[in-house]
């Protein structure tokens, strides 16, 4: 499985959408887990409603929320108030009893908000746009890990 890289700004929300074959995974709950090390186990963060029929309802664990559109075949995970410690490798999973099938691997990268950077210099922000509330999650970038990128300075 390829790994999708998603970048989000610290303090903001990051939305992850994992798509799957709706009929293949019909009747199966979904989960979001964090991988501990490259070959380590995947520690469950949150899973969809215990009653599959109610999987569309949002389930929350701390700052992570999951909901599953079982007809469209899309499970959505929202990481709210993103922190540097949230960076790492995650998995979207489809649960078959005690088994978990990996739907997608996701590498979450957290970018520091330049406004929080003490070395940002004399950055002037107009008063009316000084709040980043409601910033578009879709501004996060997604790329395939196998694609090569020039080194960043």
């Amino acid at each position: 499985l390829n790994t999708t890289v998603l970048q989000g700004m610290a303090g903001q929300s990051l939305r992850v959408s994992c798509t799957y074959d709706a009929l293949k995974h019909w009747g199966r709950r979904k989960a979001w887990c964090r991988q501990l090390g490259e070959e380590g186990p995947c520690q469950r963060v949150v899973s969809t409603h215990g009653v599959w029929l109610l999987a569309f309802l949002k389930k929350r664990n701390g700052s992570t929320v999951i909901a599953d559109d079982t007809l469209a075949g899309t499970v959505t995970i929202t990481l709210k108030n993103l922190q540097a410690g949230d960076a790492g490798l995650y998995q979207c999973q489809s649960l078959r009893g005690r088994e978990a099938e990996v739907l997608q691997k996701v590498l979450v990268e957290v970018l520091e908000d330049p406004l929080d950077d003490q070395d940002a210099g004399d950055l002037w922000v107009p008063e009316e746009s000084s709040s980043f509330e409601g910033a578009q999650v879709e501004h996060s970038t997604s790329r395939n890990q196998e694609t090569s990128f020039p080194p960043t300075s």
Epitope: K24, W26, G97
Partner: antibody, heavy 122, light 108 residues
């Protein structure tokens, strides 16, 4: 009408190969899991494995892993169960069956094929 | 794998009587993904109950299923002559989707 029609009875010798079939009709074949079940003479039902025709994802029961191969041909809406080297202990009726779905989730296995009797004898 | 145990092995009853068949799982079957099948000699199994308690299409209401977790029951409220057969439970929660050994309901 949703139907699974299996190939006819087979008589084989130990060591021979065999491929039996299960043709689905009346539904979108690629969208439902197909399972295989063995029933030895006078015995109960044994789960062998399951395949999703859409992408050929296959799960075998540990007892049958490496003993049989489950495959599909999407173009003919047919699932297969094959052996490379039959043994006398493979003598049984083999059923294919479809994983049903319900509004509330998964719905058991329905319908079932009529069964294929495989006899392995020297 | 999940092991299913059915009891009794044989149930000898008369038409009109109530039949209670038990199926016990070695581990909890989540989502109640447990089914019951009927099999008559020379025939393929037929789905009776899925999701522990939902009747399959065309199954008479004298058949009912109940239970959750590790203990499940199939009840036939009033046995008809055509109900004398073999009954299997199956869990389809965790692969491999195991069957119980079966309960034979025969005429006393």
């Amino acid at each position: 009408e949703v139907q699974l029609v299996q190939s006819g009875a087979e008589v084989k010798k130990p060591g021979e190969s065999l491929k039996i079939s299960c043709k689905g009709s009346g539904y979108t074949f690629t969208s439902y899991w197909i399972g295989w079940v063995r029933q030895m003479p006078g015995k109960g039902l044994e789960w062998m494995g399951i395949i999703y025709p859409g992408d050929s994802d296959t799960r075998y029961s540990p007892s049958f892993q490496g003993q049989v191969t489950i495959s599909v041909d999407k173009s003919s809406s047919t699932a297969y169960l094959q052996w490379s080297s039959l043994k006398a202990s493979d003598t049984a009726i083999y059923y294919c069956t479809r994983q049903a779905i319900a509004v509330t989730g998964l719905g058991g296995f329905d319908p079932w094929g009529q069964g294929t009797l495989v006899t392995v004898s020297s | 794998e999940i092991v299913l145990t059915q009891s009794p092995g044989t149930l000898s009853l008369s038409p009109g009587e109530r039949a209670t068949l038990s199926c016990r799982a070695s581990q909890s079957v989540s989502s109640s993904y447990l089914a019951w099948y009927q099999q008559k000699p020379g025939q393929a199994p037929r789905l009776l109950i899925y999701g522990a308690s939902s009747r399959a299409t065309g199954i008479p209401d004298r058949f009912s299923g109940s239970g959750s977790g590790t203990d499940f029951t199939l009840t036939i409220s009033r046995l008809e002559p055509e109900d004398f057969a073999l009954y299997y439970c199956q869990q389809y929660d965790t692969s491999p989707f195991t069957f119980g050994p079966g309960t034979k309901v025969d005429i006393k």
